[in-house]
Amino acid sequence: MPACCSCSDVFQYETNKVTRIQSMNYGTIKWFFHVIIFSYVCFALVSDKLYQRKEPVISSVHTKVKGIAEVKEEIVENGVKKLVHSVFDTADYTFPLQGNSFFVMTNFLKTEGQEQRLCPEYPTRRTLCSSDRGCKKGWMDPQSKGIQTGRCVVYEGNQKTCEVSAWCPIEAVEEAPRPALLNSAENFTVLIKNNIDFPGHNYTTRNILPGLNITCTFHKTQNPQCPIFRLGDIFRETGDNFSDVAIQGGIMGIEIYWDCNLDRWFHHCRPKYSFRRLDDKTTNVSLYPGYNFRYAKYYKENNVEKRTLIKVFGIRFDILVFGTGGKFDIIQLVVYIGSTLSYFGLAAVFIDFLIDTYSSNCCRSHIYPWCKCCQPCVVNEYYYRKKCESIVEPKPTLKYVSFVDESHIRMVNQQLLGRSLQDVKGQEVPRPAMDFTDLSRLPLALHDTPPIPGQPEEIQLLRKEATPRSRDSPVWCQCGSCLPSQLPESHRCLEELCCRKKPGACITTSELFRKLVLSRHVLQFLLLYQEPLLALDVDSTNSRLRHCAYRCYATWRFGSQDMADFAILPSCCRWRIRKEFPKSEGQYSGFKSPY
């Protein structure tokens, strides 16, 4: 169906109808949830400053390393070992690095007097040879130091290696000196200058404030704002031994964390320093542990270019600056409050879950009969009935049946397939509670109603024999007042229904049936109640009264309006009403599904 839109459709508002349950238990649960949720929401709002707009830090870093080291080197000169003392200053042990890093040399290996010529490789598994066949002219092994000439030559004694064109003599494959040559670098200090900016908040600051004592040294508790760090202390903080790391080298992270509250009333913006070892200290020898690189010092001797190759081991310090700056922002506050409102619905979800669980068939049939302490929970069935309105899908097969000798109503939602409706078991449905408010509108009609036999004469004249005369009750009849159906064979089983399940008195003999269903006075009152100016000819009046009587019976016996729409009247009642308000000619159509 196409949606039609009018002006009145636009100016509408829908809201939910709610059920308020006056219950100490559920009231307590509701407030418990609300208090817990409200407390958490407020705690999170304040502790995480969720009312602030946060912005990441933008930073620049500058470092200065200070310290002097005395190095005792063991060198071989003319086959004699000698101990050489030398002093290393900042220019000797630091190297310019890109980005937020600085490097401090802690150990080294020197290969002096190298020049470009042919010479044998240093003996290794890959370079040792027994004949020229083990060497290949032009071969460049990634692990090699030169280009092979294809010759296998004597290196020393009976050791032969492949000859290469390279910087000779070839650098020896040897371990880094132990202890580290610049072990005293542990006492070097580094000054870190860090400028930060939060452009969105138009705020700039730095880690070195005016009036800082420049002779200080950082200490985690005693001097946490000092920007001068002793290298040994940094390693102690991470649980590493500087002397051990100094041998092979390593990578250390200096973390500067800025957590800035830029609100005027709680302003705070100072850095927190922490340290983290960044290289893998468990790496095995084959995967090159530590941190090292090679560099060369070039010079000329007798017009021949030579170099001193130095394999440098040391510690690279990476300065990692991160953090956020936050300032109060009404939009962030509103967004946060909005995102937390849904949590307050948890109480309703939980209570609804309890009501639904405790009112389930499982609880009713398996738990309540055996568990005495669970008995108070039966009240949830009442809450559930008030809260939920169950609607059965109005299929063409849906029918409701009410027997006068049964407390419940039967719902039949299946095709009869030739079986009498009387014999179909169906599903038991609780009878709705009687609502007496409608009856209270009929005091005039129910008091002093004239006896039915004395009906106006003109109606009597119309009663042609439309009803069957046979007094032989059908087999399915239990009250003795039912008559066979006039419907075709295929639809007949729908009317094969008695007012009783077991033999006994017919409901049509009750005084109330006469007063509620057959009283012309009452039925006319009801018709006029609906249409005050109703004026009909005799035949249509009879039809109106008959259908009103059907409706009265259905409402009386089934209570619920929904059930009454699908109610099947017993044969005895149907024929008693038809007898009272007959059709002038033709057959009665029988029950028709309203949908």
């Epitope: 598994r125 890959r126 040792l128 040879c129 066949r133 083990g134 290949k136």
Partner: nanobody, 129 residues
Framework: DVQLVESGGGLVQPGGSLRLSCAAS????????MGWFRQAPGKEREFVAA???????DYGDSVKGRFTISRDNSKNTVPLQMNSLRPEDTAVYYC???????????????????????WGQGTLVTVSS
């Protein structure tokens, strides 16, 4: 580490055939270049045949065309099929392994005993009538 065990040695007549087998322990067998070497009494250890982890082979000059090396990575074995055996083939045959995890052994160096880190105990082959 890899442990190597040679088997299949014994006495054979000249012109006969013999199949040696080298069984290796270790899950990373497929990353090793495998070689066969032999040592006759009073002589230097001599290269016989080798096969790299990716399947390329090399043979000693004296055995080319007579010996065949192969490998079965599923069984961790390296068989050496020896045909047309001669009396000068009499020696103790050793199986050897070279780790290629960090870099393949170049083909021209498969014959170099220095490349091989792990060695078996050897199996004696005697070619005599």
């Amino acid at each position: 580490d890899v442990q190597l065990v040679e088997s299949g040695g014994g006495l054979v007549q000249p012109g006969g055939s013999l199949r040696l087998s080298c069984a290796a322990s270790g899950r990373t067998f497929r990353h090793y270049a495998m070689g066969w070497f032999r040592q006759a009494p009073g002589k230097e250890r001599e290269f016989v045949a080798a096969i790299s982890s990716y399947g390329s082979t090399d043979y000693g000059d004296s055995v080319k065309g007579r010996f065949t090396i192969s490998r079965d990575n599923s069984k961790n074995t390296v068989p050496l099929q020896m045909n047309s055996l001669r009396p000068e083939d009499t020696a103790v045959y050793y199986c050897a392994a070279a780790d290629e995890t960090l870099g393949a052994v170049p083909n021209f160096r498969l014959h170099e005993k220095y490349e091989y880190e792990y060695w078996g105990q050897g199996t004696l082959v005697t070619v005599s009538s």
